[in-house]
């Protein structure tokens, strides 16, 4: 029986050009984690494997940093980074646990502040 649960940072927002840490935590199971995959929609961002360590997908190498822990740091955020992110824990013997994080990348606070008070 898969008794575990994944706690995530949930819905988060960050400023364009900034960085954000995506984090998941697996609890309530004795299962042992062999690998964690980080995905954005259907794109693989990174893998943390028990033997091989971290692998960052080539297309994200410049903007993705491993850690802290099994988490992932996204840097130089753009509005296009807005969307769903998934942490996929491959565990023995339970199998796969998936956590979801929704990231919204906002225009810089100055721009956002200006837009908010614009007179039509």
């Amino acid at each position: 029986m898969m008794t575990g649960t994944i706690e995530t940072t949930g819905n988060i927002s960050a400023e364009k050009g900034g960085s954000i840490i995506l984090q998941c935590h697996l609890s309530s199971t004795t299962a042992q984690v062999t690998q964690v995959n980080w995905e954005q929609q259907d794109q693989l961002l990174a893998i943390c494997n028990a033997d091989l360590g971290w692998h960052i997908s080539p297309s994200f190498k410049d903007r993705v940093a491993p850690g802290p822990g099994l988490g992932l740091t996204l840097q130089s955020l753009t509005v296009n980074d807005t969307g769903e992110y998934f942490c996929i824990y491959h565990t023995y013997p339970d199998g796969t646990y998936t956590g979801r994080i929704f990231l919204e990348v906002l225009e810089s606070s100055v721009a956002e502040h200006g837009a908010r008070f614009q007179i039509p």
């Epitope: 029986m1 004795t30 299962a31 042992q32 984690v33 062999t34 690998q35 494997n49 028990a50 033997d51 824990y89 491959h90 565990t91 023995y92 013997p93 339970d94 199998g95």
Partner: antibody, heavy 119, light 109 residues
Amino acid sequence: QVQLVQSGAEVKKPGASVKISCKASGYTFTNYGMNWVRQAPGQGLEWMGWINTYTGEPTYAQKFQGRFTFTLDTSTSTAYLEISSLRSEDTAVYYCSRGNGYYVGMDYWGQGTLVTVSS
Amino acid sequence: QAVVTQEPSLTVSPGGTVTLTCGSSTGAVTTSNHANWVQQKPGQAFRGLIRGTNGRGSWTPARFSGSLLGGKAALTISGAQPEDEAEYYCALWFSNHWVFGGGTKLTVL
């Protein structure tokens, strides 16, 4: 390369205890679970349970709760199976196998340890 | 406890294709059963061939493939070799424990 090397054959009297070892090499011991499986003469394979090598927490199959104990020595990358109050029906070959969570299952196996219980 | 069934024995010609199956007394086998296939050659240790229904070990030859077929787990050997002659055991995961089948003795003749 990954290897699981088990201790040698044991002959014990009923009521005695035995402790068999499974020494792992070629990978980080605490990253993968360790299973114990037995095969009695002329019988099939039975999964006894597994131990989380990171936390040290054992999980026993229902049939193997009580007289069977899984332990670890992480400093030597060794898993142990201890059986107390041995009975003749404990005569079997005992195997350790590594538990992998990426495509769930048992990937590497030890060569087996024959335990014979006889008066 | 569930009973896992395999063909007791099968024969294949060298270069031929053979499918070994693994059924469950509880109903159709699914991906949640994480079907495993383990090979044992005479006088040798067990070797994990397939994990998680269709995941090959890094040492598993490409001619071995795992799948679900008609409600059972299946191991297909395409282009059997003499060295494939062995006993093959399947194991299925049932929520909190593994159950092994009785094994299939494969002869390459």
